[in-house]
């Protein structure tokens, strides 16, 4: 007798150990940017602060009728998902509601400014301990609202926020495009994108993870002791907050990074049905939904990663896509997708003292995308190696030749235009262990690395015969960490990480072209990191 | 998302001297003006004047102060709504669109977004 | 069938704490569909609801007792108690234990005081 | 916190006899009211719940109307084991009851 949300998101380990801990004990506080609230309900009573802060338009509408329980209905239903007695997930949470939606559910940019202000100033006045911030709101894109969470963000509160229910690119709005912000899309109870009407969920690479959104049953503003169901990507965004205050009451010390990366790497992989999105969308879409992760206690020293992708970079002929991992993530490699094929590759560069992975767009092509894979390496020094363009024939090679350095990542830049005299870049485990090796007119880029324990090795996989994609994965125990495609057709669209997966894309056309021995070759780089050992490189 | 996607940035043709006060026409103005895509969710005559990073506390009060000057100069009132220090410098005003050239100009501006709704999702 | 039984002193002293224990048979307490609820009636008048509690413990008190009440629960017993500090004569009732539907799972049935104990009758005299 | 008054105190009828019973809230409560029977030395038993829904087991001859603040139940035909105090509770904010209407033998 549990609601299908949390059963879904709270493994039948983790609800005994929730059913032992007694509530209010968590020093985690929720901050809840939403409408009104009704604290008496039974769910929240007694864990709720309602405070003054209160900064909504009016309503529209001569003949509106400002009535209570309508009013407090989407905030109720929220506060109750995160932190209810019986239907939330983070049961006894201390949650701090700040009004920043009407009764018609309406606020401002501004207005939402404020609020996260109001947070700000209740830090600096009195600070405690971990912040979890909530924002089931969605504007158009807002450079300001974006900059204020990204300000928020770095003072160590976690803001978690809703995609949008707009069946769009979640970057084309706000705060959900921010990328400091934890962007939660909706499935539902049979783990596919949630459908509303003739809208739905948002989609996309600002989306960081899905999370229940349909038919929630939680806290109704009707009475007391009323439940509702209520769908959105309001309420995902609810389950995730539960999750993280979860995670931050066992672990105060979590990270934003960390938080995210666990959050990532624990979800529930590859349930979700991407034909729902728009084709151009499924690449970008995470296919990923939350559930509570076990405790750093329980899985220490792994290394995790995750795949960011860049914006597109538009079809001009110097057209570059930027990539950027979060200040605390290491970026490991750099990759580019181009759905043409039309692309110059790929390089790592450092801007304003942060790495950052570029990829450059080929004259004719339709525009390119960089693919960042960040990770949490503790106590890593990492270094770029790059070798210009070999002349015509010749292969460049780069490996790392720092002591104790391992490589990570490689990226490959052509400086010619002409996509039929170059081959594609190889990366040569066998004859050359730890070497980045690229063919005419390539610029190679080795990502090195130093830390504790971090030992790599390459693995590589090809097909011969006709096919759109070739994969590679890192086995258990092993996080990707780099990918590439090796030589083959003479037009391959790229290559991109999904979350331990390598895969290389191979444009149609090419298929046909092929003679059976040209083989495609996707090659990932495969990491582990073993405290106790040394930093290594496997063969 | 580093890029401002589906967004609108306008720059402002703005004439170098609009009413001979030498301390305006010294300053160019190279902050823009942003508002939401959505033409149905904007909020015209409210604006969020953002300014430099390091914009000291008393300057941001000097900004908005300064607006508030200037467009009383030229017959216009405008209300200084909220100031913001702690998350970032900035203010919100309430004033006509026909102020945003000389809010602009202003030292220290960074750039101005129209304000526009949020809508519980 | 669900039944519940209340048990305690049937005197206690002004001043004192009331006691009191429900035992649940027929069902487990151990579910997240109800609350556990104390509710009074004092002799010749209408009833009161105390508080209520779920099997995880959390409570949910009268805003005009909370001061005094406390309700707990032992899963491993089946059974919830009440205690009621500083008591007056004005707390003689006959108090009742009851289940309700805590409604966060619609199937378990309407949101209400259903069944009831029978109750039992609580003197506060010296 | 929301009072419930119910009228009449005593209602004096014959088995056979058709009970209207009222309750009124001092605010609205929207359908959230349930009747209650309680007979002497027993615990009180769910008739009505959400002002119309009639509980498991409870003869039809029990109906039960309203919303908002004014409530009605009615036992359309008096058996001589309706003769009880009934009362009325609401679940819009806490759990309030009223003080009881007695419905006697005449």
């Known amino acids: 007798s549990i609601p299908w949300n949390l059963e879904r998101i709270i493994p039948a380990w983790h609800q005994t150990e929730e059913d032992r801990s007694p509530d209010g004990s968590s020093q985690v506080e929720v901050y809840l940017l939403d409408t009104s609230i009704q604290g008496a309900h039974r769910e929240i009573e007694g864990r709720v602060t309602i405070t003054d802060f209160n900064s909504v338009p009016e309503e529209d509408g001569t003949r509106f009728h400002r009535q209570a329980s309508k009013c407090d209905s989407h905030g109720t239903h929220l506060a109750g998902v995160v932190s209810g007695r019986d239907a939330g997930v983070a049961k006894g949470t201390s949650l701090h509601s700040l009004r920043v939606l009407n009764c018609q559910g309406k606020g401002t940019v501004s207005g939402t400014l404020i609020g996260l202000e109001f947070i700000r100033k209740s830090q600096l006045i009195q600070p405690s301990g971990p912040l979890v911030v909530l924002l089931p709101l969605a504007g158009g894109y807002s450079r300001i609202l974006n900059a204020a969470c990204r300000h928020l963000a770095r003072t160590g509160v976690v803001l978690v926020a809703a995609a949008g229910n707009f069946r769009d690119d979640a970057c084309l709005y706000s705060p959900a495009s921010a990328p400091e912000v934890i962007t939660v899309g909706a499935t539902n109870a049979q783990d596919q994108p949630v459908t509303l009407g003739t809208l739905g969920t948002n989609f996309g690479r600002c989306v960081d993870l899905f999370a229940p959104g349909k038919d929630i049953i939680g806290a109704s503003s009707d009475c007391s002791t009323c439940f509702m169901s209520q769908s959105g990507t309001s309420q995902a965004a609810a389950h995730v907050a539960g999750i993280v205050a979860r995670m931050l009451s066992r672990e105060p010390t979590l990270t934003l990074a960390e938080l995210r990366q666990r959050l990532i790497h624990f979800s529930t992989k590859d349930v979700i049905n991407m034909a729902w999105f728009p084709e151009d969308q499924q690449v970008l879409t995470p296919n990923l939904v939350a559930t509570l992760p076990p405790s750093t206690h329980e899985t220490g020293g792994q290394l995790l990663c995750r795949t960011v992708w860049s914006a597109h970079s538009g079809p001009t002929r110097t057209a570059t896509a930027t990539a950027r991992c979060a200040p605390e993530e290491e970026l490991l490699s750099c990759s580019s997708f181009s759905r043409s094929g039309r692309r110059r590759g790929d390089w790592i560069e450092a801007i304003g003292g942060q790495q950052v992975c570029k990829a450059l767009n080929a004259f004719g092509g339709e525009g390119v995308y960089a693919v960042a894979r960040c990770c949490l390496v503790p106590r890593a020094n990492c270094s770029i190696h790059n070798t210009p363009a070999a002349r015509a024939g010749l292969e460049t090679h780069v490996h790392c030749h720092q002591k104790d350095h391992v490589l990570t990542g490689c990226s490959f830049h052509w400086e010619v235009e002409d996509l039929s005299v170059r081959r594609q870049p190889a990366l040569r485990s066998r004859r050359q262990p730890g070497q980045c090796v690229g063919h005419q007119a390539a610029s190679v880029y080795a990502s090195c690395c130093h830390a504790p324990g971090l030992e790599c090795k390459i693995k590589e996989h090809g097909i011969s015969g006709p096919s759109e994609q070739v994969t590679v994965a890192c086995e258990a125990g092993w996080t990707l960490t780099g990918c590439n495609v090796l030589p083959g057709a003479s037009l391959t669209l790229g290559a991109y990480s999904v979350d331990n997966l390598c895969v290389a894309r191979v444009h149609d056309t090419a298929r046909a072209d092929r003679t059976s021995g040209e083989a495609t070759v996707a090659a990932a780089i495969c990491c582990r990191s073993r405290p106790s050992a040394k930093a290594s490189w496997v063969q | 998302q580093d890029e401002d996607g589906d967004y609108e940035e306008l720059m402002l043709a703005l004439p170098s001297q609009e009413d001979g006060l030498a301390d305006e026409a010294a300053h160019v103005a190279t902050a823009t003006f942003r508002r939401c895509s959505k033409e149905a969710w904007r909020l015209p005559g409210t604006y969020i004047v953002v300014l430099m990073e390091e914009t000291q506390r008393l300057q941001i009060e000097q900004t908005a102060h300064r607006l508030q000057t200037r467009a009383a100069r030229r017959g216009y009132v405008i209300k200084v709504l909220h100031i913001f220090y702690d998350l970032f410098p900035g203010f919100l005003v309430k004033m006509s669109s026909d102020l945003l050239g000389l809010a602009l100009k202003l030292p220290h501006v960074e750039y101005i977004e129209e304000d526009s709704f949020v809508f519980a999702q | 069938q669900l039944q519940l039984q209340e048990s305690g002193p049937g005197l206690v002293k002004p001043s004192e704490t009331l006691s009191l224990t429900c035992t649940v048979s027929?069902?487990?307490?151990?579910?997240?569909?109800?609350?556990w609820t104390w509710i009074r009636q004092p002799p010749g008048k209408g009833l009161e609801w105390i508080g209520s509690?779920?099997?995880?413990?959390?409570?949910y008190y009268n805003p005009s007792l909370k001061s005094r009440v406390t309700i707990s629960v032992d899963t491993s017993k089946n059974q919830f108690s009440l205690k009621l500090s500083s008591v007056t004569a004005a707390d003689t009732a006959v108090y009742y234990c009851?289940?309700?539907?805590?409604?966060?799972?619609?199937?378990?049935?309407?949101?209400?005081?259903?069944?009831w104990g029978q109750g039992t009758l609580v003197t506060v005299s010296s | 916190e929301i009072v419930l008054t119910q009228s009449p105190a005593t209602l004096s009828l014959s088995p056979g006899e058709r009970a209207t019973l009222s309750c009124r809230a001092s605010?609205?409560?929207?359908?959230?009211l349930a009747w209650y029977q309680q007979k002497p030395g027993q615990a009180p038993r769910l008739l009505i719940y959400?002002?119309?829904n009639r509980a498991t087991g409870i003869p039809a001859r029990f109906s039960g109307s309203g919303s908002g603040t004014d409530f009605t139940l009615t036992i359309s035909s008096l058996e001589p084991e309706d003769f009880a105090v009934y009362y009325c509770?609401?679940?819009?904010?806490?759990?309030?009851f009223g003080g009881g209407t007695k419905v006697e033998i005449k």
């Open positions: 509690i779920n099997y995880r413990g959390s409570t």
């Open positions: 959400d002002a119309s």
């Open positions: 009851a289940r309700e539907n805590s409604g966060v799972v619609p199937a378990a049935g309407p949101n209400w005081f259903d069944p």
């Open positions: 027929g069902g487990s307490i151990w579910s997240s569909s109800y609350y």
């Open positions: 509770q609401q679940r819009r904010n806490w759990f309030t």
């Open positions: 605010q609205s409560v929207s359908s959230y």
